[in-house]
């Protein structure tokens, strides 16, 4: 906190301008007037105050506003917005898209902080659900926001949402997030037509069940390994050698360079070995002929 | 990628005015500040100011009202000016953007100016 | 305005040595200190900022410290590439300085 001095004669601001970058902390504190400020916060931004005016400023806007300051001023905080804290924000209630863009713009570069975790949580709550305007903003500064999220949280966004999500979007969702996401989607791109449908929905796929594989293995879709990969392996499991060979079409040569891995290698074990030789890839570790499979998982589920 | 690159005469005489312009390619000159920053030989660097891309600027009082920066938004280009130049004005004259308050992070190659007559 | 003093101004170091230069400040800046690397003719390249944070793409080998006054720059496992002038700057309050720089050479 700064001291309170008297403001030296003809210092006194009359104007928020670049003059003031060459005050001292103490004379910023005594020759500022906090409503000036406040009024005139647009041009805050358009200056390039050190972070320790910074702190000053926020100190006086702090005094003026202790229950929160209003969105007039939010919106212009710029650098300001960095010396916040959670608990800050908290006390805002910022409802303007165009606020969050204003204030993820400065932060822009850096990690997500705890400050912008605590806006984009408080601007969220306050708009009820996760709209696609707010998706497409949140996904343009943090790709990964969607997987940051919980699957509690995930179900509040709307299936037209799905339609803002990039593939990058997606990259660090783990099954769970996938689980809640793939239905959306599929409902989200319901109407359009088969190639298209596929390269939408690719991203969502390992959300998918096996009978929505198995839907897919029926429409020349030629599924890259990559995306196999990120199947949920107990929806690969009860494909057919021949489900997975029209699921992947060209690219299921790939199964020999991952059959060491999931789901590949437990998928690989629940295959009669000589469904798996007519692929002539060299697939071992299939089950052996003339051995009886049974589906312990069937029995338990009828006794 | 953001790109600076400084040019002007690398020789000045004494009492002239120093005149260089840096141009900027792989990214608008706004929404950004902009410094000139001059390093002369066997001295530490010197700070001489900053030029918004709306034109506003601020500069170090040790110039004396000598510099002044203009920018030319359509040329995406940020200009100096440094008049009654001295030999203490030979320097390695360097434009940057900044990035957070009082940081530097993108510097265009730099300029060598000698003030000879 | 605040006067940025290095210490060494010049060093001699070998390859895979561990070295430390010192950046003091004449006033208290908090942590508000960058560290640059300059090699001839070339722009000085941003390593450090707020004291002790590695810019994007700076390799770990590189570490800052201090708070206040006295600060220091550590390089550790000193390859050909490191070897180069180092220059500290402080912004906490204008006119932003720079300290006069570190030359550090091959022994």
């Known amino acids: 906190e700064v001291e309170k001095t008297a403001c030296p004669s003809g210092k006194k601001a009359r104007e928020i301008d670049e003059s003031l970058i060459f005050y001292k902390k103490w004379e910023l504190e005594a020759c500022v007037d906090a409503a000036l400020l406040a009024t005139q916060m647009d041009r805050v931004n358009a200056i390039p105050f050190t972070y320790e005016q910074l702190d000053v400023l926020k100190h006086k806007l702090d005094e003026l506003y202790p229950q929160g300051y209003p969105e007039s001023v939010i919106q212009h905080l710029g650098y300001l917005f960095l010396k916040m804290s959670p608990e800050d924000i908290r006390k805002w209630n910022v409802t303007s898209l165009e606020t969050l863009k204003a204030l993820l713009e400065v932060n822009k570069g850096h990690e997500m902080s705890p400050q912008v975790a605590t806006l984009i949580d408080r601007f969220v709550k306050g708009r009820g659900q996760l709209d696609k305007d707010t998706l497409d903003t949140l996904t343009a500064f943090y790709p990964g926001y969607l997987c940051s999220l919980s699957p509690e949280e995930l179900s509040s966004v709307p299936p037209s949402s799905i339609w803002a999500v990039r593939p990058q979007d997606l990259d660090t969702c783990d099954p769970r997030q996938l689980d809640v996401l793939y239905p959306k989607a599929r409902l989200a791109f319901q109407n359009m037509n088969g190639s298209e449908y596929f390269v939408k929905i690719q991203s969502f796929l390992g959300g998918a069940p096996t009978e929505d594989l198995k839907a897919l293995s029926q429409q020349n879709v030629s599924m890259d390994l990559a995306t196999f990969m990120k199947l949920r392996t107990d929806a690969v499991l009860p494909l057919t050698v021949a489900e997975v060979q029209k699921l992947l079409g060209p690219h299921v040569e790939g199964l020999k360079a991952e059959e060491r891995h999931r789901p590949v290698r437990d998928w690989i074990l629940r295959q009669r070995q000589d469904d798996l030789d007519t692929l002539g890839l060299g697939l071992q570790g299939g089950i052996p002929n003339g051995y009886l499979v049974l589906d312990l998982s069937m029995q338990e589920a009828l006794s | 990628q953001l790109q600076l690159q400084e040019s002007g005469p690398g020789l000045v005489k004494p009492s002239e005015t120093l005149s260089l312009t840096c141009a900027v390619s792989?990214?608008?000159?706004?929404?950004?500040?902009w410094t000139w920053i001059r390093q002369s030989p066997g001295k530490a660097m010197e700070w001489m100011g900053y030029?918004?891309?709306?034109?506003?600027?601020n500069y170090n009082p040790s110039l004396e009202s000598r510099a002044t920066f203009s920018v030319d938004t359509s040329k995406n280009q940020i200009s100096l000016k440094l008049n009654s130049v001295t030999a203490a004005d030979t320097a390695v004259y360097y434009c940057?953007?900044?990035?957070?308050?009082?940081?530097?992070?993108?510097w265009g190659p730099g300029t060598l100016v000698t003030v000879s007559s | 305005d605040i006067v940025m003093t290095q210490t060494p101004s010049s060093l001699s170091a070998s390859v895979g040595d561990r070295v430390t230069i010192t950046c003091r400040a004449s006033?208290?800046?908090?942590?508000?200190l960058a560290w640059f690397q300059q090699k001839p003719g070339k722009a000085p390249k941003p390593l450090i900022y707020?004291?002790?944070s590695l810019q994007s793409g700076v390799p770990s080998k590189f570490s800052g410290s201090g708070s206040g006054t006295d600060f220091t720059l550590t390089i550790s496992n000193l390859q050909p590439e490191d070897f180069a002038t180092y220059i500290c700057?402080?912004?906490?309050?204008?006119?932003?300085?720079f300290g006069q720089g570190t030359r550090l050479e091959i022994k």
């Open positions: 940057t953007k900044v990035g957070d308050p009082g940081l530097f992070d993108y």
């Open positions: 792989g990214g608008s000159i706004s929404p950004y500040y």
């Open positions: 030029i918004h891309y709306s034109g506003r600027t």
């Open positions: 006033q208290g800046i908090s942590n508000y």
């Open positions: 707020a004291a002790s």
């Open positions: 700057q402080q912004y906490s309050s204008y006119p932003i300085t």
